[in-house]
């Protein structure tokens, strides 16, 4: 039987300073149980950008309704785009534990920043 | 429409074992966590245990008792019960998980139970 | 563990009467609770899941309302099919998922 998938569609996505971007993510199951995080960059030093369950992330607001019934869209916007945004965002899939562990990650889709227009 | 069918419930002595199952149908079950809810005579729900793909997750009365499975290719829940005990007298309801945004898991559709009685 | 505290244990009510019962948890939950109906010799049913979303099917007159620690579930108008007994079960932090002890409504 088909393993989990975590389908990042875009490898890229260019995005005026200014604007919002909207990262793309999508997963085939419902299972295993545990959240989907995101991050910009990869390995031990990769930074935190949206966790549904705790944290303050005001820059973030999930695409799906928050009310969406077995959902496996986990897509995100990130408002007010800086250059400081620039890099490689993963949507990353762990699997319930104690501590939660991470199970699958997507292929990441790397975010440019271009100049404001104006 | 999704069908829950629990079987294998029965009158068993304290320390036998006992094999419960749940035949699923009406939605894609390979997707899907299930879990099983135990209800005491005359008492409230009690969760008994969850599995998702091979993760399981058990309540601390039944852990190192009871084993969770299933059978993807059958649409079948199974829960093994193992060391039984006067206790675990109770409906064993099989019940489908479902998921809301980012959370979960709930219980939105129940089978009808079936009842297991340990007692000498 | 979250603990689940249903009040009260038992309401009796006239046909027609506005029902409010009580689920108080140990700790914030956020909006991570459903609420369920049992008959007896029956099987639970979903109603309210996210605190406030009715489950499809479910009649307008219930209602959720609550988050954090505090949650409610109305039925604006009790119907003879109302008599049961109502479940709360908080899903923000688990295993072990939790119910609170019910809360049983009986014709007055």
């Known amino acids: 039987e088909e393993e989990l998938q975590v389908i990042q569609p875009d490898k890229s996505v260019s995005v005026a300073a200014g604007e919002s971007a909207i990262l793309h993510c999508t997963v085939t199951s419902l299972i295993p149980v545990g959240p989907i995080q995101w991050f910009r960059g990869a390995g031990p030093a990769r930074e935190l950008i949206y966790n549904q369950k705790e944290g303050h992330f005001p820059r973030v607001t999930t695409v799906s309704e928050s009310t969406k019934r077995e959902n496996m869209d986990f897509s995100i916007s990130i408002s007010n785009i800086t250059p400081a945004d620039a890099g490689t965002y993963y949507c990353v899939k762990f699997r319930k534990g104690s501590p939660d562990t991470e199970f699958k990650s997507g292929a990441g889709t790397e975010l440019s920043v271009r100049a404001k227009p104006s | 429409d999704v069908q829950l069918v629990e079987s294998g419930g029965g009158v068993v002595r304290p320390g036998e074992s006992l094999r419960l199952s749940c035949a699923a149908s009406?939605?894609?079950?390979?997707?899907?966590?299930v879990s099983w809810v135990r209800q005491a005579p005359g008492e409230g729900l009690e969760w008994v245990s969850t599995i998702g793909a091979d993760d399981t997750y058990y309540a601390d009365s039944v852990k190192g008792r009871f084993t969770i499975s299933r059978d993807n290719s059958k649409n079948t829940l199974y829960l093994q019960m193992n060391s039984l005990r006067a206790e675990d007298t109770a409906v064993y309801y099989c019940a489908k998980d479902s998921t809301v945004g980012w959370s979960g898991d709930f219980f939105d559709y129940w089978g009808l139970g079936t009842l297991v009685t340990v007692s000498s | 563990e979250i603990v689940l505290t249903q009040s009260p244990a038992t309401l009796s009510v006239s046909p027609g009467e506005r029902v409010t019962f009580s689920c108080r948890a140990s700790?914030?939950?956020?909006?991570?609770i459903a609420w369920y109906q049992q008959k007896p010799g029956q099987a639970p049913r979903l109603l309210i899941y996210?605190?406030?979303s009715r489950d499809t099917g479910i009649p307008d007159r219930f209602s959720g309302s609550g988050s954090g620690t505090d949650f409610t579930l109305t039925i604006s108008s009790l119907q003879s099919e109302d008599f049961g007994v109502y479940y709360c079960?908080?899903?923000?932090?688990?295993?072990?998922?939790?119910f609170g002890g019910g809360t049983k409504v009986e014709i007055k």
């Open positions: 996210a605190a406030s």
């Open positions: 009406g939605f894609s079950f390979s997707i899907y966590a």
């Open positions: 079960q908080q899903y923000y932090d688990w295993p072990p998922f939790t």
């Open positions: 700790q914030n939950v956020r909006s991570d």
